[in-house]
């Protein structure tokens, strides 16, 4: 058993049929010595008396809020949560496996630049009685500070018969140099509590590997005289690290109709302009990627050809 | 190796082309190592990230763009020097183009070159003959060093009398290649910045 936060405790259980469970001793936080009784949740049934209560925790029915009282007055609470371990593996029932970039990916993180700010998100089908808490650091043995905000519900989607909820959190490394060469990864730890079930999820990454620039901005077309070709120009996104001559981007320019199966014109360039062939009912799209370290491409920025 | 046929953009900052080749060569070599050593811990997640130049050179700090010198997090051990030297500097005069930066890059390359050559000598003794260093990568390191045109004491190639542990050598190769790729990215960014200055 360990303390998650004040008066909240996590009991780690090997989860299999007829498992013996864990013996837990609860102590009432009071100077009083006698006349103390214990109850669980909203029940008035007295579970025991005395300053300490010993219980055998085997299942979710044994978890919950234990309260010690004296003469009708509440002295203190202890909330017990369960963390299940099945076949030596901690349960991952609360969050959905996003399967990208690989299986067992529950947390996904992205950074728009090298400033040390990043966003992580996760998915669940659970809509109520759900809380998250996020901690992060650079390295684990001698951790350096990363400050994370509160996790918030950022999107709701309908997937078939199910509703899916996306939560996200923003974190910022306390003293980040955009030009630094990372040797210790960022560690992100998410504590998830659904009703009386506790789970924790972790992700470890270098900022350089989760870079995904914002799309290029200010796309403009200039038709070339006596030609089907147009010159398309754009600018670096405002959120990208500066100076741009040090943090350079490379771009992919594509002309395509509405369907992905349609024919297209595609060219890669390090410049902020390119010449392409425009077709009726097609769009010109441009996306960006770090020129020197190939992490993710940005989303497309698009303008119609006509 | 074949002699180059055409020299692109003759006015270009001389080292930019070499640094681009360097990043390409080390990235290819790392990819090859990952594929060939698929049953060894050779991915970024599996290896320990070591920097053989740590406390010996200060490339990131010495080559920091002027715009980032206002960022206190970037100034841990920054020593500024505005002396210009080395053939890559051509005749451009900007305070960023400091000898310290380019000589630090040169020292990095020299250290990695020695490590790679020592390692290759060991890998050539491996009866499995599983992986060797790409000669192109070694040649590109050499070309960039020549373009930087700094003179410094020759570092003797390490020779070891004991029987090499090939498993450890291959893991060390992965560690070295990952670190060198990260340094090559920094070098490329620096050269691109210098070229634009």
């Amino acid at each position: 058993i360990w303390e998650l936060k004040k008066d909240v405790y996590v009991v780690e259980l090997d989860w299999y049929p007829d498992a013996p469970g864990e013996m837990v001793v609860l102590t009432c936080d009071t100077p009083e010595e006698d006349g103390i009784t214990w109850t669980l949740d909203q029940s008035s049934e007295v579970l025991g008396s005395g300053k300490t209560l010993t219980i055998q925790v085997k299942e979710f029915g044994d978890a919950g809020q234990y309260t010690c009282h004296k003469g009708g007055e509440v002295l203190s609470h202890s909330l017990l949560l369960l963390h299940k371990k099945e076949d030596g593996i901690w349960s991952t029932d609360i969050l959905k496996d996003q399967k990208e970039p690989k299986n067992k990916t529950f947390l996904r993180c992205e950074a728009k630049n090298y400033s040390g700010r990043f966003t992580c998100w996760w998915l669940t089908t659970i809509s109520t009685d759900l809380t998250f808490s996020v901690k992060s650091s650079r390295g684990s043995s001698d951790p350096q500070g990363v400050t994370c905000g509160a996790a918030t519900l950022s999107a709701e989607r309908v997937r078939g018969d199910n509703k899916e909820y996306e939560y996200s959190v923003e974190c910022q490394e306390d003293s980040a140099c955009p030009a630094a060469e990372e040797s210790l990864p960022i560690e992100v730890m998410v504590d998830a509590v659904h009703k009386l079930k506790y789970e924790n999820y972790t992700s470890s990454f270098f900022i350089r590997d989760i870079i995904k620039p914002d799309p290029p901005k200010n796309l403009q077309l200039k038709p070339l005289k006596n030609s089907r070709q147009v010159e398309v120009s754009w600018e670096y996104p405002d959120t990208w690290s500066t100076p741009h001559s040090y943090f350079s981007l490379t771009f992919c320019v594509q002309v395509q109709g509405k369907s992905k199966r349609e024919k297209k014109d595609r060219v890669f360039t390090d410049k902020t302009s390119a010449t392409v062939i425009c077709r009726k009912n097609a769009s010109i799209s441009v996306r960006a990627q770090d020129r020197y370290y190939s992490s993710s491409w940005s989303e497309w920025a698009s303008v119609p050809c006509s | 190796r074949n002699l180059p046929v055409a020299t692109p953009d003759p006015g270009m900052f001389p080292c930019l082309h070499h640094s681009q080749n360097l990043l390409r060569a080390v990235s290819n070599m790392l990819q090859k190592a990952r594929q060939t050593l698929e049953f060894y811990p050779c991915t970024s997640e599996e290896i320990d990230h070591e920097d053989i130049t740590k406390d010996k050179t200060s490339t990131v700090e010495a080559c920091l763009p002027l715009e980032l010198t206002k960022n206190e997090s970037c100034l841990n051990s920054r020593e500024t020097s505005f002396i210009t030297n080395g053939s890559c500097l051509a005749s451009r005069k900007t305070s960023f183009m400091m000898a310290l930066c380019l000589s630090s890059i040169y020292e990095d390359l020299k250290m990695y070159q020695v490590e790679f050559k020592t390692m290759n000598a060991k890998l050539l003794m491996d009866p499995k003959r599983q992986i060797f260093l790409d000669q192109n990568m070694l040649a590109v390191i050499d070309e960039l060093m020549q373009a930087l045109n700094f003179n410094s004491e020759t570092v003797p190639q390490k020779s070891s009398l004991e029987e090499p542990d090939f498993y450890k050598t291959k893991i060390k190769l992965c560690i070295l290649l990952h670190a060198f790729r990260i340094r090559a990215v920094t070098i490329d960014r620096v050269m691109s910045y210098l070229n634009a200055s």
Epitope: R228, R261, K263, K264, D265, R266, V267 | P8
Partner: antibody
Framework: QVQLVQSGAEVKKPGSSVKVSCKAS????????LHWVRQAPGQGLEWMGW????????EYAPKFQGRVTITADESTSTAYMELSSLRSEDTAVYYC???????????WGQGTLVTVSS | DIVMTQSPLSLPVTPGEPASISCRAS??????LHWYQQKPGQQPRQLIA???QSISGVPSRFSGSGSGTDFTLTISSLQPEDFATYYC?????????FGQGTKVEIK
Amino acid sequence: QVQLVQSGAEVKKPGSSVKVSCKASGGTFSDYYLHWVRQAPGQGLEWMGWIDPENGDTEYAPKFQGRVTITADESTSTAYMELSSLRSEDTAVYYCARNKELRYIDVWGQGTLVTVSS
Amino acid sequence: DIVMTQSPLSLPVTPGEPASISCRASQSISINLHWYQQKPGQQPRQLIAFASQSISGVPSRFSGSGSGTDFTLTISSLQPEDFATYYCQQSNSFPLTFGQGTKVEIK
């Protein structure tokens, strides 16, 4: 299976014109760009131009501008390349080729040998 | 026009050995570079798109690398069927241009 079948070999006199055809099968004809590339005996590949069969848009290499005409007939899924004012150095194998991507080629025809000789 | 220069023009290789062909552009073309193989009396066949993207159906021993002005086609271990002429082609701008070709011959 996408296939491009070209017309047979031709022998032409200098100053005359030649029209080579290329019939496409497999896939929708207008879903692809069609290119013409030639190869003189023992020489490398030389791009001549492309056509978008959907709208008839064309682009020619400056070297052939004014001498080459590429057309397409959607009803028969056939593209044509006509080269006029032939000279002996136009002796080559002419390939039609196609791709959904405009700037490179993934499927080639078998080639048509055009010999220009007096 | 962008001039593509291949080297060497002839490359004698022992079967089973690796081979590397170089292609250089007269100006920077990013990764807008494609590789083709042509056997005598046959039409060309696409091998690599955009400098390093492999094409389905092409053996994994063929790989491409490079960006900017310098590109390489590598055959990790030459098979008897790989003896042919190889061409690079730039798609950075029109007109599309090819290298002169590199003939890989049996040593």
